[in-house]
């Protein structure tokens, strides 16, 4: 039975050209996290954090994605096209797969809202394959 929940940074905003930290946290389960996959709104993979093998940043994002902090991901040099949904997929044993969602809004530099600002609505979501 899956007892865990994923807590994420929820809906966040950041300025164009700035950076933002995408963060998820799995709680309420003793399951072992074997891998965390970070995915973008168009279903492309940004990065994989394998518990033993470390980080793999996808080639298309190597210039502007940095691993961490922790199991999170730092997205740099933001463009307006980065606006949208991001997903963290936790592969765990023995529970299976949990998934969390973050919505990032990238704001024009002249507008309000700092990097990582804009009201952090903690969002709980879990999903099993």
């Amino acid at each position: 039975m899956m007892t865990g929940t994923i807590e994420t940074t929820g809906n966040i905003s950041a300025k164009k050209g700035g950076s933002v930290i995408l963060q998820c946290h799995l709680s309420s389960t003793m399951a072992q996290v074997t891998q965390v996959n970070w995915e973008q709104h168009d279903h492309s993979l940004l990065a994989i954090r394998n518990a033993e093998l470390g980080w793999h940043i996808y080639p298309a994002f190597k210039d502007r994605v940095a691993p961490g902090p922790g199991l999170g991901l730092t997205l740099q040099s933001l463009t307006m096209n980065d606006t949208g949904e991001y997903f963290c997929t936790y592969h765990t044993y023995p529970d299976g797969t949990y998934r969390g969602r973050i919505f990032l809004e990238v704001l024009e530099s002249s507008g309000g809202g700092g990097a990582g600002g804009g009201g952090h609505h903690h969002h709980h979501h879990h999903h099993h394959h």
Partner: antibody
Framework: QVQLQESGPGLVKPSGTLSLTCAVS?????????WHWVRQPPGKGLEWIGY???????NYNPSLKSRVTISVDKSKNQFSLKLSSVTAADTAVYYC??????????????WGQGTLVTVSS | DIQMTQSPSSLSASVGDRVTITCKAS??????VAWYQQKPGKAPKLLIY???YRYTGVPSRFSGSGSGTDFTFTISSLQPEDIATYYC?????????FGGGTKLEIK
Amino acid sequence: QVQLQESGPGLVKPSGTLSLTCAVSGYSITSGYSWHWVRQPPGKGLEWIGYVHYSGSTNYNPSLKSRVTISVDKSKNQFSLKLSSVTAADTAVYYCARMDYGNYGGAMDYWGQGTLVTVSS
Amino acid sequence: DIQMTQSPSSLSASVGDRVTITCKASQDVRTAVAWYQQKPGKAPKLLIYSASYRYTGVPSRFSGSGSGTDFTFTISSLQPEDIATYYCQQYYSTQWTFGGGTKLEIK
């Protein structure tokens, strides 16, 4: 240039233990990467068996986990595979391979030439 | 486990032909797919990783595309030295799995 070379008995008796070694040259296996075993039954596809990470941790295919041990011999710069309680279904060409996870994800970029192991009495 | 189903299992083509091999994953694997070439009696060689990126030294006639569950491997102009069996592999999950292979022959 990294090179991998498998060695070990080509014939193993049913219920016995298959033991293979992969000698690595051109790179110290305790310096980085993960080191894998993959097998290919005659005329069939590839099956991942498991790996040993340079740190010493291991991970195995769940379907084989109860029978597999992969270990490292630092002094000889080699890693080994032991597969117990073998049957004819374990007859295959066994490959060792390297995975550069940081650059290529779960793709294996260097392979040994493979060694055929037949399980027969 | 995630199953990778390749098609066709074998195909025959002429030198200069455009050749396409497909691989279907049993669940969404995003772009965590690699392609290998294996010549008879030899070890597999990595050609493509992350679905569409050519490995170092791989000729430009080899390409990969796709995301989610459907992936394509293409040889734009078949050369005699391309005769081999080609395999896809997924690494989205922590248990890596390969397709059954596509054997490519010259007409």
